[in-house]
Interface confidence: low
């Protein structure tokens, strides 16, 4: 133990920090299996053959790349979040849908529209989301634009949740936006379509109030040869939850100290 | 000490505790020198008698009252930060001053604007500063309003700082937005009038813009007899910075370990 | 700050973050996990030296303050300040798994 | 969380946020801060359990080992978690100031 | 607009126990400080203590064994527990905010409840 | 415990009168002194804080004044609706707020 210690970590003390580091890693070791909530690690019998499903690496990718607008992970967390989150996605509605029909010739605007069927298949119940983020691939772009999300509220109303100024950019960029209290809501709601709305930011008194930004999946093709890739990198929403079979364990087990 | 502390970790660890304390306190004695880079208190024979000055009080009030839109300290905070900042208020420039001629008959937005010599008074030095608060006093209100914060970027044209959503309120409240990145830019120009635009939220498709917030020492005054409260409570720059004298110090005695 | 970038690159004896990569097969003896193979966990280590006496060079004593004691605490000790998650890939049974572990890797450390 | 509300209402053996009002003039001897006349400075104290043994009633050590050893630490310290700046008054010659002190009140501790 | 309501007074016997709530409206209760105060009858007021935003405690010394102050921020309530009462605990007990100026102005009682009777007899 | 002690308890003055209410402190309390008025059947009032800055809405006829262990509320034209008693209290921290045990102002 180091604590209030004024001695340097001399030669003398190179076993104390092989001990630190055996501890760490047991610690580690408890760390890794409590969070999953498991008593010793799982059997791997029935794991098939061959490589990770492509689907699935995507996801895990996905998860492990920080993106624009998303920070690290806050700390300190609350309790239920120690425990470790299953991570799926959920794709917009296919662009083909006749939802989209009436949102074509608005150009200031962009709309995403949700299944929360869908949602509701991966998060069976709204406390056990712990993070919704919508992520959408912007094309490459040469002009600087500031840029709004909004919620679907009622017919014909939308509700502001965010903006972001885009800055120029060689490459294709992932957004991400935090949702987690919108997709909180529409999991209380009944099954339906739900969606968001991102928009140009019109000021008072500007005339130009056209979106200039282009998102992979929602702007025209430009290469036939891209509509799988495209499809692939179409807006979608991350979800985080607590497995509905650990949420109950959590549930029963829980005590105050 | 006569705080309640019916917690006790057990009699026989009491002694423990209180020597706990004890370090605490000494560790404290030693952060608040060393915070304002004392050796020693400071003499107290120059001192004048009687309370303190009103304008002083109303600045520790100011810095120790959390406002709608401030966050808690920030922790982790760079070296600098370490060391205590001396807290001065800058208020805007007076409604009758010719400069507000043009902007009287526009509905969507009010207009602040602040010398920056009175600026350069408090901070003689960009680096010095390490925040900067516009605080403005929202009066009471019963409608939602979105609303949005520009600088004054060039002759015509606005720059978008931030928003927030002010929900109905009963009585008067302190709005506070970070605006430390453009304090530091007025102070790296030269001296001249800067200011700032209050707007209501325009969206692409909205007929009202109209901005419904009334702001204390901006909007019409209700009553004559408010006169000096009204104006001690217009809006105001909260200017936090390392004093010139500490600054010198700092930079003289900086190493790395 | 005490993070990676000071920290791996220096030979400080105070409350630093050192490396630490754990490799799940070899350190933990697990196949279980599919990705990543292991990570970068780091730990945080090193005395946080109480020097508060104005009888000692007057600058240093505030700068070793300064880093080692921004809490002021009885007894500041070497913990992690920033964090960062860890996702994995596992099987349950036939169904692959991604799941986000949080706060798994130490980017900083601090005296508090 | 290890906060006030918790830890003042409960007597909690472990890790926790403890009282401690600092009266500038009766603990420090200081009448040079005209304002505050004192302020809840806090402190953390308390062990780190470190509680992870599969044989042990399984939920009891989950829920203990979640609450004390967030960060798996080699050896968890309780420090402080959440801090708040505290401003005063002074006088330098005729000159009041106004300063404000970063981190000064302990608001909740965690073990890390 | 600024509104103090306490309940749970009444008529109880010695050495039984009774919690009074003071129920807050109009301000945001769990930025302030909160005290309770008690007169009895024909006489002056008392102040049997405080509670700060945090949950921090302070109580008049003849308080301390048998008076407990605690708040529920969530349900902006504020509660005194009472235990063991005697005769002489007999009065009208107050919740008042605390003012919240500079310094420790927070046991200046800006605004009071109506109060809540509270007797002592067997 | 710092103990408070006004003076006189009670007093009988007319409409129109200046009345003087003195508070003594049992050890100095800098100017954390408060002052309250005190109708039958309602709550307490806050009249006055720090010894002498006037709360809002209060008339002006109303004044305080002291530091450290004496201090005096003053009203310098008694009006109808002044009749009741008035406390003074101390705040100088947690271990000494305690109130005066209350001086009634009567008709004559």
């Known amino acids: 133990d180091y604590k209030d210690d004024d001695d340097k970590l001399s030669t003398s003390k190179t076993i104390d920090m092989e001990l630190v580091k055996r501890k760490r890693i047991e610690a580690i070791r408890g760390q890794i299996l409590s969070k999953l909530r498991l008593a010793s690690p799982p059997s791997q019998g029935e794991v098939p053959p061959g490589p990770l499903p492509e689907a699935v690496l995507a996801l895990y990718n996905s998860t492990r790349d920080r993106v624009a607008g998303e920070s690290a992970d806050p700390e300190p967390e609350p309790e239920a979040d120690y425990y470790a989150k299953e991570v799926t996605r959920v794709l917009m509605v296919d662009r083909n849908n006749a939802i989209y029909e009436k949102t074509k010739d608005i150009s200031h605007s962009i709309y995403m529209f949700f299944n929360t069927s869908d949602i509701r298949e991966a998060v069976p119940e709204p406390p056990l989301l712990s993070r919704a983020e919508l992520r959408l691939q912007r094309l490459k772009s040469s002009v600087e634009q500031h840029v709004e999300l909004y919620q679907k509220y009622s017919n014909n109303s939308w509700r502001y949740l965010g903006n972001r100024l885009l800055t120029p950019t060689d490459t294709p960029e992932w957004l991400s936006f935090d949702v987690t209290g919108v997709v909180r809501q529409w999991l209380n709601q009944g099954d339906g379509i739900q969606g968001f709305r991102f928009s140009a930011h019109c000021s008072c008194d500007s005339k130009d109030n056209k979106l200039h930004v282009e998102i992979n999946g929602i702007s025209p093709k430009r290469r036939g040869d891209l509509g799988t890739i495209h499809d692939m990198n179409r807006p979608f929403l991350l979800l985080m939850a607590t497995p509905l079979e650990r949420a109950q364990h959590l549930h029963s087990s829980r005590h105050r100290r | 000490d006569y705080k309640d502390d019916d917690d006790k970790l057990s009699t026989s660890k009491t002694i423990d505790m209180e020597l706990v304390k004890r370090k605490r306190i000494e560790a404290i004695r030693g952060q608040i020198l060393s915070k304002l880079r004392l050796a020693s208190p400071p003499s107290q024979g120059e001192v004048p008698p009687g309370p303190l000055p009103e304008a002083v009080l109303a600045l520790y009030n100011s810095t120790r009252d959390r406002v709608a839109g401030e966050s808690a300290d920030p922790e982790p905070e760079p070296e600098a930060d370490y060391y205590a900042k001396e807290v001065t208020r800058v208020l805007m420039v007076d409604r009758n001053n010719a400069i507000y001629e043009k902007t009287k008959d526009i509905s969507h937005s009010i207009y602040m604007f602040f010398n920056t010599s009175d600026i350069r008074e408090a901070v003689p030095e960009p680096p010095l500063l390490s925040r900067a608060e516009l605080r403005l006093q929202r009066l009471k209100s019963s409608v939602e309003q979105h609303v949005e914060l520009y600088q004054k970027y060039s002759n015509n044209s606005w720059r978008y700082l931030g928003n927030r959503l002010l929900t109905p309120t009963d009585t008067p409240e302190w709005l506070s937005f970070d605006v430390t990145g453009v304090v530091r830019q007025w102070l790296n120009q030269g001296d001249g009038i800067q200011g700032f635009r209050f707007s209501a939220h325009c969206s692409c498709d909205s007929k009202d813009n109209k901005l419904h917030v009334e702001i204390n020492g901006i909007s019409p005054k209700r009553r004559g007899d408010l006169g000096t409260i009204h104006d001690m409570n217009r809006p105001f720059l909260l200017l936090m910075a390392t004093p010139l004298e500490r600054a010198q110090h700092l930079h003289s005695s900086r190493h790395r370990r | 700050a005490l993070d990676t970038n000071y920290c791996f690159s220096s030979t400080e004896k105070n409350c630093c973050v050192r490396q630490l990569y754990i490799d799940f097969r070899k350190d933990l003896g697990w196949k279980w996990i599919h990705e990543p193979k292991g990570y970068h966990a780091n730990f945080c280590l090193g005395p946080c030296p109480y020097i508060w006496s104005l009888d000692t060079q007057y600058s240093k004593v505030l700068a070793l303050y300064n880093q080692h004691n921004p809490g002021a605490s009885a007894s500041p000790c070497c913990v992690p300040q920033a964090l960062e998650p860890l996702p994995i890939v596992y099987y349950v049974g036939r169904k692959p798994k991604v799941e986000q572990l949080s706060n798994m890797i130490v980017r900083s450390c601090k005296c508090s | 969380a290890l906060d006030t509300n918790y830890c003042f209402s409960s007597t909690e053996k472990n890790c926790c946020v403890r009282q401690l009002y600092i009266d500038f003039r009766k603990d420090l001897g200081w009448k040079w801060i005209h304002e505050p006349k004192g302020y809840h400075a806090n402190f953390c104290l308390g062990p780190c359990p470190y509680i992870w043994s599969l044989d042990t009633q399984y939920s009891k050590v989950l829920a203990l080992y979640n609450q004390h050893n967030p960060g798996a630490s080699a050896s968890p310290c309780c420090v402080p978690q959440a801090l708040e700046p505290l401003p005063i008054v002074y006088y330098v010659g005729r000159k009041p100031k106004v300063e404000q002190l970063s981190n000064m009140i302990v608001r909740s501790c965690k073990c890390s | 607009q600024v509104q103090l309501v306490e309940s749970g007074g009444g008529v109880v016997q010695p050495g039984r126990s009774l919690r009074l709530s003071c129920a807050a409206s109009?301000?945001?209760?769990?930025?302030?400080?909160m005290n309770w105060i008690r007169q009895p009858p024909g006489k002056g007021l008392e102040w049997i203590g405080y509670i700060y935003t945090s949950g921090t405690t302070y109580r008049a010394n003849w308080a301390r064994g048998r008076f407990t102050i605690s708040r529920d921020n969530s349900k902006n309530t504020l509660y005194l527990q009472m235990n063991s009462l005697r005769a002489e605990d007999t009065a009208v007990y107050y919740c008042a905010r605390g003012w919240h100026i500079f310094g420790h102005h927070y046991w200046v009682m800006h605004f009071w409840g109506q109060g809540t009777l509270v007797t002592v007899s067997s | 415990d710092i103990q408070m002690t006004q003076s006189p308890s009670s007093l009988s003055a007319s409409v129109g009168d200046r009345v003087t209410i003195t508070c003594q402190a049992s050890?100095?309390?800098?100017?954390?002194l408060a002052w309250y008025q005190q109708k039958p059947g309602q709550p307490p009032k806050l009249l006055i804080y720090a010894a002498s800055t006037l709360e809002w809405g209060v008339p002006s006829r109303f004044s305080g004044s002291g530091s450290g262990t004496d201090f005096t509320l003053t009203i310098s034209s008694l009006q109808p609706e002044d009749f009741a008693t008035y406390y003074c209290?101390?705040?100088?921290?947690?271990?000494?707020?305690?109130f005066g045990q209350g001086t009634k102002v009567e008709i004559k």
């Open positions: 050890q100095s309390i800098s100017t954390y």
């Open positions: 109009g301000f945001h209760f769990s930025s302030e400080a």
């Open positions: 209290q101390s705040y100088s921290d947690g271990d000494s707020v305690g």
